[in-house]
């Protein structure tokens, strides 16, 4: 299966809104998407969110911080191909995120 293509849709100081897409023929085989994310530089702990939709908002994040985000399709056969590992950054408190 083709891996999900992931986009950053929006961000705040404490959240990241992420969406993804896969080719329509594959969508019927997917029952959930698993979103794994963690702070950049912190390889010991990560968070997992599961959703049936094509987007998620990751909340309670730290300001001006980069997070590694990956989306994986879950099918009846098991895990599909994972997306690229993306780096998304929350806004700084001043709102001047680069």
């Amino acid at each position: 299966t083709e891996p999900p293509k992931v986009r950053l849709e929006g961000r705040s100081t404490t959240s990241l809104s992420v969406s993804w897409s896969i080719p329509p023929p594959q969508q019927s085989r997917v029952w959930k998407y698993e979103v794994t994310y963690r702070k950049k530089g912190d390889s010991n702990s990560y968070n997992v969110r599961r959703t049936e939709g094509f987007s998620v908002t990751l909340d309670d994040l730290a300001p001006d911080t980069t997070y590694l985000v990956q989306v994986q399709a879950l099918t009846q056969e098991g895990q599909g191909a994972g997306s690229k590992v993306h780096e998304f950054q929350t806004l700084s408190p001043e709102g001047s995120g680069n």
Epitope: P3, L8, L16, K40, A81, G82, H86, L91
Partner: antibody
Framework: QVQLQQWGAGLLKPSETLSLTCAVY????????WSWIRQPPGKGLEWIGE??????????NYNPSLKSRVTISVDPSKNQFSLKLTSVTAADTAVYYC?????????????????????WGQGTMVTVAS | SYVLTQPPSVSVAPGQTARITCGGN??????VHWYQQKPGQAPVLVVY???DRPSGIPEQFSGSNSGNTATLTISRVEAGDEADYYC???????????FGGGTKLTVLG
């Protein structure tokens, strides 16, 4: 179009300190993570480390195999960054390159660690011999 | 630390297609970049983000990446393509940049 020009001593004795500087012409200096890469004669490429200067803070990241001996610093007023490698041995003999990543490190919240290098310095051959 | 494995050498006849592989654990989740280096010169970026070409790089250079292998494909190979080729990724687990060992492409004849 960004250009990189590098210079520094080409012949060192063992235990001395290697010192190279790379000047950046054009482009936005603070938007990028600037890297040093080396290539021993007849061998492959080895990433040494990178530096970014944002605000008044330097962000450094070094290859673990060289970390104890490497310092990469910046002079933002001159758009220059420098490499220092202490206690050199013959194994440090190589062509040393400075390099610029293809994209600014972060743009609208999307970041590119370890981006491709689209512009390279001309290379400096450094020989360590007694 | 993350390791990228390339074949030391690949040989191909002029006009044929050369495929150079870069192996790494779950490399499909990473963006792979490819460089061409000719003797005495600095490396030149020929493919980035698995399959994108910088401006000025001909269409004969293409790339793909899936599972544990990324591939640089050079179609209609000519003598001027003889060079060393290197793959590169960012290892997000260690936050370090890694190069493959390089592949020497020889154009026969």
């Amino acid at each position: 179009q960004v250009q990189l020009q590098q210079w520094g001593a080409g012949l060192l004795k063992p235990s001395e300190t290697l010192s190279l500087t790379c000047a950046v012409y054009g482009g936005s200096f603070s938007d990028y993570y600037w890297s040093w890469i080396r290539q021993p004669p007849g061998k492959g490429l080895e990433w040494i480390g990178e530096v970014n200067h944002r605000g008044s803070i330097n962000y450094n990241n070094y290859n673990p195999s060289l970390k104890s001996r490497v310092t990469i610093s910046v002079d933002p007023s001159k758009n220059q960054f420098s490499l220092k490698l202490t206690s050199v041995t013959a194994a440090d003999t190589a062509v040393y390159y400075c390099a610029k990543p293809l994209r600014p490190h972060c743009t609208n919240g999307v970041c590119y660690s370890g981006d491709a290098f689209d512009i390279w310095g001309q290379g400096t051959m450094v020989t360590v011999a007694s | 630390s993350y390791v990228l494995t390339q074949p030391p050498s690949v040989s191909v006849a002029p006009g044929q297609t050369a495929r150079i592989t870069c192996g790494g654990n779950n490399i499909g989740s990473k963006n792979v970049h490819w460089y061409q280096q000719k003797p005495g010169q600095a490396p030149v970026l020929v493919v980035y983000d698995d399959s994108d070409r910088p401006s000025g790089i001909p269409e004969q250079f293409s790339g793909s990446n899936s599972g544990n292998t990324a591939t640089l494909t050079i179609s209609r190979v000519e003598a001027g393509d003889e060079a060393d080729y290197y793959c590169q990724v960012w290892d997000s687990s260690s936050d370090h940049l890694v190069f493959g060992g390089g592949t020497k492409l020889t154009v026969l004849g």
